[in-house]
Each structure stands twice: as structure tokens, then as C-alpha cells.
């Protein structure tokens, strides 16, 4: 079958990294610079992906494979195949339309991406606050006052003063 197919279609003999050049009697020509063909028998080469701006070249384009991009440091991938890059923020911040903003009082973000989330409400589980929350960390809940042995007391540190106005990164 392969032999039959190659007799019928001379282009099937063209390997990856080449294309079947109709302008040159269907001779296999190498892919031009900045293009590639990842399979044999192709009549055109595909243009290489270019990694610019927020995108970083992780793997260069070759005659047989496309370039691979990820995000330049300070940004992180979003979408299938890293189709988009979003700016990192510091821990304790979230990305808004106006850039990175500090988490509001009562919320935290322990990552460089994502949104600020409310501190855990320990009292909903009948527990007390063992360690206060910050912009970067959730509160740590301790045992409920009833769980403590007689004579022991649950020390709940005072909540920190309200943060000053938000400032961009």
C-alpha cells in the first residue's frame, strides 16, 4: 500500500521538515526559516509560533517542531497550552484592573496569583482563633473553649489594626 501510495502521490515521500513544492515538480524542499512541518507529506510548512513580550521561548522552533512558549518570570500561564499570561502579584495581594492591590482587612492570599479570600471564621466550627490572620496567611483555629481543661483559658490575641489604604505593587 505504501509503495502504491507513493507512486500515486510523490508528496508522501517528503519527510517532516520539508514540504512538497508544487512550483518545483513536487520536489521535497526544506521548510524556509521560521517555519516547520511536523509530519511527512505536507504541501506547506507552518509558521513558527513566536514568543514575545509576556511569553518566553522555552523551546526553539526547528524544521520539524513548533516553538514552545511559557510565561516570562513575573507572569504565570492561563488557558490551554499557556495561551495567555497573567501578571504575578506578591503574596497578600490580588490582581485588579488597576494592577496588584493589597488584600482588604479580613482577607488573605498566600499565592502570587488568584484572589484574596476571607479568613476562616473559627467560631462557625465552635473554635477559637489561635493565630491571627494576615494579608498573606489565614487564621489558625484552635480548640473550642469547652475543649480546654479546667483552669486553662483560651487566649485570643486582639485583631490587628485596620490596614492603611491599599497601594499598588
Amino acid at each position: 500500500f505504501e509503495r502504491t501510495r507513493s507512486l500515486q502521490d510523490p508528496c508522501s515521500n517528503c519527510p517532516a521538515g520539508t514540504f512538497c513544492d508544487n512550483n518545483r515538480n513536487q520536489i521535497c524542499s526544506p521548510c524556509p526559516p521560521n517555519s516547520f512541518s511536523s509530519a511527512g507529506g505536507q504541501r506547506t510548512c507552518d509558521i513558527c509560533r513566536q514568543c514575545k513580550g509576556v511569553f518566553r521561548t522555552r523551546k526553539e522552533c526547528s524544521s520539524t517542531s513548533n516553538a514552545e512558549c511559557d510565561c516570562t518570570p513575573g507572569f504565570h500561564c492561563l488557558g490551554a497550552g499557556c495561551s495567555m499570561c497573567e501578571q504575578d502579584c506578591k503574596q497578600g495581594q490580588e490582581l485588579t484592573k488597576k494592577g496588584c492591590k493589597d488584600c482588604c482587612f479580613g482577607t488573605f492570599n498566600d499565592q502570587k496569583r488568584g484572589i484574596c479570600r476571607p479568613w476562616t471564621n473559627c467560631s462557625l466550627d465552635g473554635k477559637s482563633v489561635l493565630v491571627n490572620g494576615t494579608k498573606e496567611r489565614d487564621v489558625v483555629c484552635g480548640p473550642s473553649p469547652a475543649d480546654l481543661s479546667p483552669g486553662a483559658s483560651s487566649v485570643t490575641p486582639p485583631a490587628p489594626a485596620r490596614e492603611p489604604g491599599h497601594s499598588p505593587q
Partner: antibody
Framework: QVTLKESGPGILQPSQTLSLTCSFS??????????VGWIRQPSGKGLEWLAH???????RYNPALKSRLTISKDTSSSQVFLKIASVDTADTATYYC??????????WGQGTLVTVSA | DIVLTQSPDSLAVSLGQRATISCRAS??????????MHWYQQKPGQPPKLLIY???NLESGIPARFSGSGSRTDFTLTINVVEADDVATYYC?????????FGGGTKLEIK
């Protein structure tokens, strides 16, 4: 405190290979997002980017010089190396290495002067 | 390659006055709302020093009299109240596209 220091041969002859070393402290090339780049500056002239290497060993070269350049790193000894093959008098310059974060050269070494002379 | 053209080549400013340096790119250096244009200061006999990154972000430890603005192809470095210590050559740099390139430099002197 981030510091970088370049070292090289000082003088070499045309057609030889230039070997440069960048020794750094205050950061690690095993840290995600970190990189080290090389830039050169002929006396009294402007700056030219040569190459850089990222924490994950992704290497990038100036296409105009790519065939002559090789960049590498030794993470454990906090060093980055640049080799330039077949040097010519046009390669006479001060060579800088710089710490890279988010595609900018954040901290620079003092530079090392390289003279190519017959 | 992206060509960066700085103007003027040199300027003389009186102490306390404002200095403005322009950098024009041969094509846009913007990506996803970020401009990949940066500014460096180089004093005689010293390596360059980062002042501004991504067009308008002041690098840590740099005095607030330095500021950057612009987008796409046109960028400006402004020194609001020039001091004697600001005598240097200033370079713009794009990291939008390889090869990364630098402007030719602008030499700032005191009048």
C-alpha cells in the same frame, strides 16, 4: 545583598576563544524566575545583549552572534559561563553579567575589560 | 530587530530643573497591557543601574524624582528635580522581542 563579579583573560589574540566567568551571590539560579545575562559595551559606545540563561536551563542567544556563543551554568557553585569562539578586534569591550528578574537586568557586575589584539 | 532611538543624544539641564529623555521603538513593545521597556542609568566608570522597569515601575531604592511613562512605541524618562548626582548616560532597553536591544544612550550634563 546581590553581587556579581565577572572574570576573564584580559587580553587574547584574534581567532582564540574567549572564556568569561560570572560569580554571583545573594541569589540562587535554582530559584524559579531567576536568570543571568551577559551584555557587552565597547569603550565609549552603547550596550549589546549577548545571551542569557534561566533557572530551568533555557538558553537564549543574540542571533547575530549565536554561532559563536555558548552559555552555561553551575548552580551549585553560583557561576555562569560564556564562551565566544573565533574572537576578532571587534570583540574588544567591557563584558558585564547581570541578574535577571522578569526580563530586566536588575543587578550588574562591575564588568571585565577584554582586549583582542594581535 | 527592534531599533530603539533615543533623543536627544545629550542634554544640559540646570540644577533643580526637569530633564526629559525620549525613546522611540521601531515597533510596539506592548504585550497584554504591559510595556517591555526599561531604563538604566550609567555613571562614568560604573556599570548600568536599573531605574525603571516595564515603562513606569520605579525600581526599589531609586529616588522618586525619576519616573517613566509611555506605551507601544513612545516612552519617556523624566527626572523631576535634577541633582548633580544625576550626571550620567541613560539607556532604554526593550525585552519584548529577541534580540533584546538598547537605545544609543542620552548623556545628561549640568548646565
Amino acid at each position: 545583598q546581590v553581587t556579581l563579579k565577572e572574570s576573564g583573560p584580559g587580553i587574547l589574540q584574534p581567532s582564540q576563544t574567549l572564556s568569561l566567568t560570572c560569580s554571583f551571590s545573594g541569589f540562587s539560579l535554582s530559584t524559579s524566575g531567576m536568570g543571568v545575562g551577559w551584555i557587552r559595551q565597547p569603550s565609549g559606545k552603547g550596550l549589546e545583549w549577548l545571551a542569557h540563561i534561566w533557572w530551568d536551563d533555557v538558553k537564549r542567544y543574540n542571533p547575530a552572534l549565536k554561532s559563536r556563543l555558548t552559555i552555561s551554568k553551575d548552580t551549585s557553585s553560583s557561576q555562569v559561563f560564556l564562551k565566544i569562539a573565533s574572537v576578532d578586534t571587534a570583540d574588544t569591550a567591557t563584558y558585564y553579567c547581570a541578574q535577571m528578574t522578569s526580563s530586566v537586568f536588575a543587578y550588574w557586575g562591575q564588568g571585565t575589560l577584554v582586549t583582542v589584539s594581535a | 530587530d527592534i531599533v530603539l532611538t533615543q533623543s536627544p543624544d545629550s542634554l544640559a539641564v540646570s540644577l533643580g530643573q526637569r530633564a526629559t529623555i525620549s525613546c522611540r521603538a521601531s515597533e510596539s513593545v506592548d504585550s497584554y497591557g504591559h510595556s517591555f521597556m526599561h531604563w538604566y542609568q550609567q555613571k562614568p566608570g560604573q556599570p548600568p543601574k536599573l531605574l525603571i522597569y516595564r515603562a513606569s515601575n520605579l525600581e526599589s531604592g531609586i529616588p522618586a524624582r525619576f519616573s517613566g511613562s509611555g506605551s507601544r512605541t513612545d516612552f519617556t524618562l523624566t527626572i523631576n528635580v535634577v541633582e548633580a548626582d544625576d550626571v550620567a548616560t541613560y539607556y532604554c532597553h526593550q525585552s519584548y522581542e529577541e534580540p533584546w536591544t538598547f537605545g544609543g544612550g542620552t548623556k545628561l550634563e549640568i548646565k
